[in-house]
Interface confidence: low
């Protein structure tokens, strides 16, 4: 089964090659809207130094395999090379959100991207009713990514002094109220991203319409609107809307909950101070440590490494997990030196899968939580690749 492009087509996505000072605009179904790339460009690359933009992938020259999309062009790689054409290759992996296209590398001929997204999953378990892009680049080309805040079920309760109402929101997607562990959101209308509970009734006060926007280097904004349908009586004829402003704090701090800063005629303004609004390089590294210079905090997990010894064992319900944290690749898990996490099915010990690899390691410290992520594991039945936190 190929990638579900419909979910990605509604938006023009952005990726950045910061080393070469280039911005890519990506619309997997066609027009990225930049004139010099032409009307059928699916991937347009803009050189920030020269302000020149050129197409590196044409929507009319698209070919696809199950998890790979290739966009060719009619342009030769170099003036002297008329044989090979410039092309873009996007590898899709199943993810829990729409995700973001990540620039991997570029050669003279091929621009490579990787995209972990629900659009690539075999099963619909993570698919949202409505989801919008949840990241933005600042003018230093640093990525601000709120995808980790997206809830797959339920919502966030907004801190509000009104005892008669409770406002719940999700980030960049609708609230999946049916899968909410607490039953109170089950009454929320399907598709709402902002649900107001008043008495025993629930009102849809906003749905995601467009992606996350950057206001300044430390402020991001998301707007939910309710355009169709009848307006609740208490809105005094106004259409409900919710504006959520995410603020990167000026120094490291624990996480806070979203706070209602203003409301009038069903227009709700919410401010959320969260380190996820800061640029991603401030929050994470690909090693097992974070430094005071870059991350404003010093953390080193390398003492947890099991050099030459046995891995940590974690007992799950169906699986036993073997974990080699920040480890020495001489410790072979799943008979594979690349494996950082390995899972073995309890009912059948021959069923062994890599659940994360050393080369796909991310250490993240945000809102007081320290998370070590190993991705790039073997494929699951959902199409999802194993991914260990």
């Amino acid at each position: 089964q190929a990638v579900d492009l419909d979910a990605l087509c509604s938006y023009t996505w952005e990726a950045v090659d910061s080393k070469n000072n280039a911005v890519y605009k990506i619309n997997v179904c066609g027009n990225v809207g930049i004139s010099s790339c032409g009307p059928t460009s699916a991937i347009c690359m803009c050189d920030l130094k020269t302000e020149n933009c050129r197409s590196v992938g044409d929507s009319l020259l698209r070919s696809s395999a199950r998890s790979l999309l290739e966009f060719n062009t009619t342009m030769g790689c170099q003036p002297s090379d008329s044989q090979h054409r410039i092309q873009t290759s996007i590898t899709f992996l199943c993810g829990k959100t729409l995700g973001t296209p990540e620039f991997v590398t570029a050669t003279d001929c091929v621009h490579y991207f990787e995209w972990r997204t629900t659009a690539a999953c075999k099963k619909d378990i993570f698919k949202a009713d409505k989801e919008v892009p949840c990241y933005a680049f600042d003018d230093k080309l640093q990525k601000h990514d709120l995808n980790p805040l997206i809830k797959l079920n339920g919502g966030y309760l907004v801190d509000d002094s009104d005892p008669d109402t409770s406002l719940f929101i999700n980030v960049c997607r609708d609230i999946d109220s049916l899968r909410d562990p607490s039953t109170q959101l089950r009454v929320c209308p399907a598709g709402t991203a902002a649900c107001l509970l008043k008495g025993n009734q629930a009102f849809d006060v906003g749905r995601p319409k467009e992606g996350l926007k950057l206001l300044s280097k430390d402020r991001l904004v998301l707007t939910y609107v309710k355009e169709e349908g009848e307006k609740p009586d208490f809105c005094n004829g106004h259409s409900p809307a919710v504006t959520v402003t995410f603020v990167c704090p000026s120094e490291r701090r624990e996480g806070t909950i979203p706070k209602l800063t203003a409301k009038s005629n069903c227009r709700y303004e919410v401010e959320w101070i969260t380190e996820y609004a800061c640029h991603r390089d401030y929050l994470q590294s690909e090693s097992c440590s974070l430094s005071s210079e870059q991350h404003d905090i010093t953390i080193d997990l390398s003492p947890l490494a099991q050099y030459g010894g046995s891995p940590y064992v974690s007992d799950g319900r169906e699986y036993t997990f073997f974990i080699n944290v920040c480890g020495d690749t001489k410790v072979s898990l799943c008979n594979n030196k690349e494996a950082a996490v390995c899972q073995e099915k309890k009912a059948d010990s021959t069923q062994v899968k890599i659940a994360g690899r050393h080369q796909n390691q991310t250490l993240r410290y945000s809102d007081g939580d320290l998370t070590l992520i190993y991705s790039g594991g073997d494929e699951c039945s959902s199409g999802h690749h194993h991914h260990h936190h």
């Epitope: 280039a22 911005v23 930049i34 010099s36 347009c44 803009c46 920030l48 003018d139 950057l214």
Partner: nanobody, 124 residues
């Protein structure tokens, strides 16, 4: 230092057209990226369109693609926004902006100079 002044706003019916102008004073206009933004009361200013210093490359937000055209005449130190098939949701104060640093027009933040704004109202 670049000073910007918008003109051409007004009240029109849905479906009508309007052309906004932005005149710049200062010798460097031909070297800088130009942009148009709009704002409705109670909302943040939002990006509409931008044009590179040469005028070769233009970029539009999704909601105006195919309806709005940005252009510039460097000899006259002027940038334009031709708005066709206007909708009530296009109502707002339109600002022209300019950016001296040579960043991509695809980046919609980081503008250094701003005009005072001109009101566009589209009635249904």
């Amino acid at each position: 230092q670049v000073q910007l002044q918008e003109s051409g706003g007004g009240l029109v019916q849905a479906g009508d057209s309007l052309k906004l102008s932005c005149t710049a004073s200062g010798p460097t206009f031909s070297e800088i990226t130009g942009g148009w933004f709009r704002q409705v009361p109670g909302k943040e200013r939002e990006f509409v369109a931008s044009i590179s210093s040469t005028g070769i490359t233009t970029y539009y937000t999704d909601s105006v693609k195919g309806r709005f055209t940005v252009s510039r005449d460097n000899a006259k130190n002027t940038m334009y926004l031709q708005m066709n098939s206007l909708k009530p949701e296009d109502t707002g104060v339109y600002y022209c902006a300019a950016r001296s640093t040579s960043r991509s027009i695809a980046i919609t933040v980081g503008y250094d100079y701003w005009g005072q704004g001109t009101q566009v109202t589209v009635s249904s």
